[in-house]
Amino acid sequence: DSSKWVFEHPETLYAWEGACVWIPCTYRALDGDLESFILFHNPEYNKNTSKFDGTRLYESTKDGKVPSEQKRVQFLGDKNKNCTLSIHPVHLNDSGQLGLRMESKTEKWMERIHLNVSERPFPPHIQLPPEIQESQEVTLTCLLNFSCYGYPIQLQWLLEGVPMRQAAVTSTSLTIKSVFTRSELKFSPQWSHHGKIVTCQLQDADGKFLSNDTVQLNVKHTPKLEIKVTPSDAIVREGDSVTMTCEVSSSNPEYTTVSWLKDGTSLKKQNTFTLNLREVTKDQSGKYCCQVSNDVGPGRSEEVFLQVQYAPEPSTVQILHSPAVEGSQVEFLCMSLANPLPTNYTWYHNGKEMQGRTEEKVHIPKILPWHAGTYSCVAENILGTGQRGPGAELDVQYPPKKVTTVIQNPMPIREGDTVTLSCNYNSSNPSVTRYEWKPHGAWEEPSLGVLKIQNVGWDNTTIACAACNSWCSWASPVALNVQYAPRDVRVRKIKPLSEIHSGNSVSLQCDFSSSHPKEVQFFWEKNGRLLGKESQLNFDSISPEDAGSYSCWVNNSIGQTASKAWTLEVLYAPRRLRVSMSPGDQVMEGKSATLTCESDANPPVSHYTWFDWNNQSLPYHSQKLRLEPVKVQHSGAYWCQGTNSVGKGRSPLSTLTVYYSPETIGRR
């Protein structure tokens, strides 16, 4: 109630001889500050004197002086809230009640604190969880109801007398609520810790033993088992017997059931500590263990690997990369169940032994078409040789091989023929699905791999084909060697280089651009008449009569070809001039007489000149000389001269006779 002083401190403090006591303490006085403080040991109230009797351990006066013998006890408080005390060292006879006599100006109070000082350091107390299971982390607690600033201590954990490796966490409390030192150790006990002694040892600052507490661990765990096998290496041959024994080395609590497992699966009707396997087969190879259960759970022994040895079983071949592309690499793997593992292998390709191949894997660095086929193997171990299995098929894919373009026609091929070609190949994998031809043309392919060229051209020289599967293989081009009649036959003048004049030496050449076969014959023709059989037609001295239309023919075994007609033109001076008279060479005076200068000339006469019987040129220059009216005086001999670019020609004299008319005669 409100008439009480309020104190807070631990109810009892514990220590031992020679240690110290630190008493955390707070208070609140009823009024004002503390004026007087006395620490009694076992105080008793004297009703007569109305004062407390007892040993005074500490006394503070108004002037704050403390007698020198009171140095062992220290008041660490103040005048209004802190009443903390320290006794150092503390003695056995300090046990009992401590009385804190507090006085203020108007109020007094006696506060009692119990002090328990033992002769020797008292042991700490180990606290364990209610149940400990293997591999489950637990916290072990070691608690000592002591802590004092002036007397450092340490708590150490030991397992079977050996310091524990795990790190402990030590904490201290020096509060008005509690005074203690505590060490906590996190620990995952194993089954092997069952029954072991754990110690918490109290030591002074130098590690000197002061006291301890011990507990025996009760670690709940599944049964711990040992498996024994006969024969000890667990390696047997088919038909042998095997015995396995299961021994329980530890179980907490006691075990309840036993079973056996092979490769993790429980074996039926095997519920004893001994497993007998009679006349084992290879199927009984595997990992065996026994399983024993208790309330914690099942425990399993280590596995025993029972190896039932046997000769290799029929082998199979695994091919890495089939189908394989020619030139690539391929690996073969021989798979055969055997125990022990095969030490030697024999490989076969299409039934024939592959020399020098004795390993589980065969690697072919560059696959070729002839590597295709069936690969099989035989495995061998110490117990014998296996059988050859069915093998595996290697498919080697490659472009078509030895592709050729073949001309189906009888030879020779003539221009205009229909030519049939086929594209042949030796082998192909996968099969050929299409063909290509070079050069491209508007040709028909009547069937796969056949090309038909209708009306073959003279200039169809070479053709190549390709046979294609996933790849195309081209054949070497084949020459069609088309035969044809001579082509582009024409007449060409070799000499003279300029125009031909009468009397010149003239050579004409019969040209052609090509002929197959090359052997040819020539023919020259003029107006349907054969002139010669050489490639040239020669005129030593050309005459105007040689002019005309010439053709040459060239023929070979295929046919003949004519040139276009070529006109030979001979230039010559006017010749064969004559003067013709119309209406005749006798004309009556007064009539009209026409003289014509006729000539043969190439080019035609460009200029005429007329002469009379006196060789006097007349003032007329056209082909015709017209006398109208004609006079008797015109009678006489006339001649003409014709001129062209080549030269001049003159006619012989022609006489004109002009006779008198009847009228003139009548007048005479």
């Epitope: 020619e326 030139g327 020399q355 020098g356 072919i364 660095p365 560059k366 070729l368 002839w370 091989k401």
Partner: antibody, heavy 124, light 110 residues
Framework: QVTLKESGPGILQPSQTLSLTCSFS??????????VGWIRQPSGKGLEWLAH???????YYNPALKSRLTISKDTSKNQVFLKIANVDTADTATYYC????????????????WGTGTTVTVSA | QAVVTQESALTTSPGETVTLTCRSS?????????ANWVQEKPDHLFTGLIG???NRAPGVPARFSGSLIGDKAALTITGAQTEDEAIYFC?????????FGSGTKVTVLG
């Protein structure tokens, strides 16, 4: 009968490109399983494989020289070529070409037939 | 790059058996190294003897055989003849390139 014949410039200067030709007869590089390789031998020393080429145009090069080497073939002319760029005196050697073949019925390759070599001197 | 090591020289007598070995610096020689053995006779006359570790090239006498002995490739001449006096080179395949050994000079004392 299989024969191989190497030809080269005989002598060339540092930094030039060495061009070698291997002309062969008795087999074709269009035939499956056929290859031609180049090997050199500096005077008094061992053999150094340079490169080889297979019928299917697969090419392999000595890693230490790869950046300088080019191997090629002309199947129709039965020739294989090797170019070595930026030569120096260390490239002085006898250069051999050899057929590398996988004969019919075999699974591995052989350096079975060799040329007689051509001597190349790199000199400043 | 790997180094391929061979005995520098071996001496034998006619009719004797001699074994040449070929070691790889990268570890054990396996069948995947496709060991090849090549014979060099005077005047740069080279002939391929063995391919793929243990396969004789066509036309090679049966006295030449290839094998793996321990971690090395080996060439055995069973019943050596005087004409077998030569330098023998091995070549090992490393995934994408060959490396030749330094060669073993075999002397057949007649």
């Amino acid at each position: 009968q299989v024969t191989l014949k190497e030809s080269g410039p005989g002598i060339l200067q540092p930094s030039q490109t060495l061009s070698l030709t291997c002309s062969f007869s008795g087999f074709s590089l269009s035939t499956s399983g056929m290859g031609v390789g180049w090997i050199r031998q500096p005077s008094g020393k061992g053999l150094e494989w340079l490169a080889h080429i297979w019928w299917d145009d697969d090419e392999y090069y000595n890693p230490a020289l790869k950046s300088r080497l080019t191997i090629s073939k002309d199947t129709s002319k039965n020739q294989v070529f090797l170019k070595i760029a930026n030569v120096d005196t260390a490239d002085t050697a006898t250069y051999y070409c050899a057929r590398i073949s996988i004969p019919y019925g075999y699974y591995d390759w052989f350096f079975d037939v060799w040329g007689t070599g051509t001597t190349v001197t790199v000199s400043a | 790059q790997a180094v391929v090591t061979q005995e520098s020289a071996l001496t034998t007598s006619p009719g004797e058996t001699v074994t040449l070995t070929c070691r790889s610096s990268t570890g054990a020689v396996t069948t995947r190294n496709y060991a090849n053995w090549v014979q060099e006779k005077p005047d740069h006359l080279f002939t391929g003897l063995i391919g793929g570790t243990n396969n004789r090239a066509p036309g090679v006498p049966a006295r030449f055989s290839g094998s793996l002995i321990g971690d090395k490739a080996a060439l055995t001449i069973t019943g050596a003849q005087t004409e077998d006096e030569a330098i023998y080179f091995c070549a090992l395949w490393y995934s994408n390139h060959f490396i030749f050994g330094s060669g073993t000079k075999v002397t057949v004392l007649g």
